[in-house]
């Protein structure tokens, strides 16, 4: 008989990443018969929810339903109706909600309560809304990139399926930068750790991994900027803050109440003789870099080696994938190429930050001014964090790969989270039977 293709049994999953600055909905799909194979799940859609992060809805929770509507309706369109009831939906909230919970557990729960109420109105199988830990965020990001890079598959290939794939099974480290926190996760050379808080052990596809991870709350790019402003306004002689991290000619009024709203600025809080101050950009990379370095306390370390603020960091090992805002910022600045050295990146940042604001606005007319104005700070912050915070060097810089997507799927914690919660990462290597995955008769 002639070979006929059978309709493939496809499954779907939805994960909402409720970040500090915005929420994104990701839709994943995979062949049902292959769910224990490595590398078969891929992203079919990303929908960015219009508006800020869910923590900003704390005083207007009744608007959360409308906020989520467009992307949930998009999911309804993308996923075949016959699959709706079977499709799991997860929402994970990250550092923005961790900060809200620090201020008020009750308010954080109220937000999540309304999120569940809203998501339960859709035909999908809602599994839960929760605030994930920083450790989970780091670990799931690490799982995502290594899953997509094929690092967990035991089959050695003579060809490379993705640009960063070396043929060895050495895992990539994961560098994740959000608005409110940043994570570093990798397998260190030395398996014994001085800090059990930073140690994770996984058995994936029949192999054991001893992983180091840490999440730095308040060191995402947006909260780091608030910290820097709060620190610098302490020593300002009046209500004008001449700021090297903004372009020359840039001006912006900041409310002191907004500055002190976040728990991240508490350590710098003081009574100021004004309610508002004006940022005036002077566009000087070197001075901006110096100002940023003051956010990292490197004077105290109770371990053999630390990142900053007394947090253990083992010696860096292997290649790293840097994603989320690490990628978005560096991609905007056109600095993601593997060929660009750290010295060249610094040079380009110096040039970029010194460009007049009017010139920048003209060159990037399509970009929202709020975002555009912060790229000088964000780029400088990324360099400072990677070099002084995590101790990358000019030589080890070439081991950092700025990654947006891997084979069409966004790098980030959401895929790893779904793989874990749907039990699609087996501890043991699945036995492959030659006929079990056939779609032909």
């Amino acid at each position: 008989t002639q070979n006929k293709a059978l309709p493939e049994n496809i499954k779907y999953g939805i994960v909402l990443d409720a970040g500090s600055s915005h929420t994104s909905l990701y839709i994943y799909k995979w062949p049902a018969e292959k769910e224990n194979d490595t590398g078969v799940v891929h992203q079919v859609e990303e929908c960015r929810v219009k508006g800020p992060g869910i923590s900003k809805y704390v005083q207007k929770v009744n608007e959360i339903g409308i906020y989520l509507t467009d992307c949930m309706e998009r999911a309804r369109e993308v996923i075949p109706r016959s699959q709706h009831q079977e499709t799991p939906v997860y929402l994970g909230a990250t550092a923005g909600m961790r900060l809200l919970r620090m201020e008020s557990e009750e308010l954080a729960d109220r937000v999540l309560d309304v999120v569940e109420r809203s998501l339960s109105n859709y035909p999908f199988d809602f599994q839960g809304a929760r605030i994930i830990t920083g450790q989970e965020e780091g670990a799931y990001g690490w799982i995502t990139i290594n899953y997509l890079l094929g690092k967990f598959s035991q089959k050695t290939r003579w060809f490379s399926i993705v640009p960063y794939e070396t043929n060895n099974q050495e895992t990539f480290g994961a560098l994740d930068l959000g608005g409110a926190s940043t994570q570093i996760t990798f397998v260190p050379q030395n398996q014994t750790t001085e800090s059990p808080d930073n140690a994770l052990q996984f058995r994936l596809y029949g192999k054991d991994y001893n992983v180091y991870t840490h999440s730095f709350l308040c060191y995402g790019k947006d909260q780091a900027l608030w910290q820097k402003l709060a620190k610098d306004i302490q020593v300002a002689s009046n209500e004008i803050l001449r700021d090297p991290c903004f372009h020359p000619g840039y001006k912006k009024v900041v409310n002191v109440s907004d500055l002190y709203k976040t728990p991240c600025t508490k350590r710098f809080e003081m009574t100021l003789p004004f309610q508002q101050f004006e940022i005036q950009g002077i566009g000087n990379y070197q001075q901006c870099h110096q100002s940023v370095l003051e956010l990292f306390n490197t004077s105290y370390c109770p371990y053999s080696q630390c990142a900053f603020n007394g947090i253990f960091l083992p010696p860096l090992q292997g290649d790293f994938g840097a994603f989320s805002a690490f990628y978005f910022v560096m991609n905007f600045l056109n600095l993601t190429s593997e060929k660009v050295s750290q010295e060249k990146v610094t040079e380009m940042m110096k040039k970029f930050c010194s460009q007049p604001w009017e010139e920048i606005k003209t060159s990037y007319a399509g970009v929202k001014e709020k975002y555009l104005s912060e790229y000088c700070f964000s780029g400088t912050y990324i360099l400072s964090l990677l070099l002084q915070g995590y101790h990358f060097t000019a030589d080890s810089w070439e081991h950092i790969h700025f990654i947006g997507k891997i084979q069409g799927s966004d790098a980030g914690w959401t895929l790893g989270y779904m793989l874990n919660l749907t039990n699609m990462i087996p501890a043991e290597q699945p036995l492959s039977t030659p006929l079990s995955h056939s779609t032909y008769v």
Epitope: S120, Q127, A129
Partner: nanobody
């Protein structure tokens, strides 16, 4: 791992009411769907009802719809089962169940990883 402690079982006449409680220690309570299952002598454990983390989704077995109500109080880490119009066939050991980041629908199918309480006896007899 969460720990579950049931209370409220006992002997009741047909047509009577009973309220079971299940208190959870350890874990973040709102991250768990909670449910009740029952096992009559010589029978398998059967699904009765389940509720989502913040209480907006509930599922009931057909045999108890309209008579039993599940609810939760996240401030007390407690889930309740209000049982009205009890019948002799409701006699069983009732087990509280918790499933992390799992829908009530999946609990109904006994899918995912479920943590069980010790069980409390409910006897409906005149």
């Amino acid at each position: 791992e969460v720990q579950l402690l049931e209370s409220g079982g006992g002997l009741v006449q047909p047509g009577g009411s009973l309220r079971l409680s299940c208190t959870v220690s350890r874990g973040t309570f709102s991250e768990y769907s909670m449910g009740w299952f029952r096992q009559a002598p010589g029978q398998e454990r059967d699904f009765v009802t389940a509720i989502s983390g913040f209480g907006h989704i509930t599922h009931y077995a057909d045999s108890v719809k309209g008579r039993f109500t599940i609810s939760r109080d996240n401030s007390k880490n407690t889930v309740y089962l209000q049982m009205n119009s009890l019948k002799p066939e409701d006699t069983a050991v009732y087990y509280c169940a918790a499933a992390w980041q799992t829908s009530p629908r999946r609990m109904m199918q006994m899918a995912g990883s479920i943590t069980w309480g010790q069980g409390t006896q409910v006897t409906v007899s005149s």
